[in-house]
């Protein structure tokens, strides 16, 4: 969470941004809020990126002005125009690229004053893992798969019954480069699993952490997955 203040004569406004992460190839949002101003035509929103000449996006007089927009953002950005008057200056970003990572500035000018705040935008790839029982294996085993990760994550297994156990000797993890030559598919196999136990496959890099749980009993298989972004907010 970054709060910036701006001074315009006697007036300053508070601008707040949230560090966030973008998933390569998907659409993302760079969050920014400011003190609301009902005079839409008096609001100017400028998004800038450190190291880039030109603007990422500009919104003024109630509409976009992309005349100064940098080529790398062409056709990829939009503000939530109907939410500007309530203080939302967040930026939608289409088809997030690895090169979109960096420091952004959300600059606001309203009839109340000026303000700005920086935002650190991380880019990578992260996806939910899916765990299945691998019936093809010679012994009972579990297969944990996640289709898209970058940078290369670490993978660890855990068990509810054998808490604190090290499963590195009885698991095998591989990383397969996807067709776009950036992200990778993660596959990890855990061998010699026992019935009536809950196992967790944890995949983590500096952007995100994902966990897949599976419980295998004689009568059913229960699964659960979750994904959390790290260092956000």
């Amino acid at each position: 969470l970054i709060i910036g203040f701006g001074i315009s004569g006697k007036h300053f406004i508070t601008v707040t941004t949230f560090t966030s992460a973008g998933n390569i190839g998907e659409d993302g949002t760079l969050s920014c809020t400011f003190e609301p101003d009902i005079k839409l035509n008096g609001i100017v929103i400028q998004w800038l990126k450190e190291g880039i000449k030109g603007l990422v996006h500009e919104f003024k007089e109630g509409k976009d002005d992309l005349s100064q927009q940098h080529e790398m953002f062409r056709g990829r950005t939009a503000v939530f125009a109907d939410q500007v008057v309530v203080g939302n200056a967040s930026l939608r970003l289409k088809n997030v690229q690895l090169t979109d990572a960096g420091t952004y500035t959300c600059y606001i000018h309203t009839s109340k004053g000026k303000g700005n705040a920086n935002l650190e935008y991380k880019t990578g790839a992260f996806s939910m893992p899916e765990i299945n029982v691998d019936y093809n294996a010679s012994s009972e085993s579990l297969r944990c798969e996640a289709p898209r990760w970058f940078p290369q994550p670490t993978v660890a297994w855990a068990s509810q019954v054998d808490q604190g156990a090290n499963f590195s000797e009885v698991s095998n993890t591989s990383f397969e480069l996807n067709s776009e030559n950036v992200t990778m598919k993660v596959v990890s196999v855990l061998y010699n699993v026992t019935i009536n136990n809950t196992y967790s496959c944890m995949i983590e890099n500096d952007i995100a952490k994902a966990t897949g749980d599976i419980k295998v009993t004689d009568s059913e298989v229960k699964r659960r997955s979750q994904l959390e972004l790290l260092n956000s907010g």
Epitope: E26, D64, L66, S67, G75, R92, S179
Partner: antibody
Framework: QLQLQESGPGLVKPSETLSLTCTVS??????????WGWIRQPPGKGLEWIGN???????YYNPSLRSRVTISVDTSKNQFSLKLSSVTAADTAVYYC????????????WGQGTLVTVSS | EIVMTQSPATLSVSPGERATLSCRAS??????LAWYQQKPGQAPRLLIY???TRATGIPARFSGSGSGTEFTLTISSLQSEDFAVYYC?????????FGGGTKVEIK
Amino acid sequence: QLQLQESGPGLVKPSETLSLTCTVSGGSIKSGSYYWGWIRQPPGKGLEWIGNIYYSGSTYYNPSLRSRVTISVDTSKNQFSLKLSSVTAADTAVYYCAREGSYPNQFDPWGQGTLVTVSS
Amino acid sequence: EIVMTQSPATLSVSPGERATLSCRASQSVSSNLAWYQQKPGQAPRLLIYGASTRATGIPARFSGSGSGTEFTLTISSLQSEDFAVYYCQQYHSFPFTFGGGTKVEIK
């Protein structure tokens, strides 16, 4: 409401330059949230995006046509234009102009289209 | 470039019936997809953008769904004016590309 109208020669000789103009009425070409694009459709075939322009003059072209395409804008006339050089029979198509959202980038509305035939 | 593939090429449907048209992208386009209707001698008309948002003035019988690489346009009850060619278009990355079209004809 906003309307677009293509105009230009219906017949162009091989190796010459195809030139079309799109006139925008019912709204300003300087509307900030839009690009202005060209799309073509050979007879009986599908649609191909040619490129777009912003009112400030910045352009983006389809790489398959980039070496032959020029799109320009005249804000004083509320018009934008397409030039396609070194044409062949494969460039025979209905050419449409359209307003293109800055993002989302859908095309709406479209001109009615103009058929350009490349033949000697 | 991203290749858009539509199926079937032709769909024969009786008036009042449901029509389901498919569009597949060669790689993920997230939800950055639009659908258009084109009648003979006319320009295409925008139906759906953002994969599922109906354009202004488009009847509720038209609905879009899907994300990533698989998309569907559904016409819940075909009217006589709906017989036309339908195109999908991705705007996820340049160059923007269209599918080859699906012709919906009267059965």
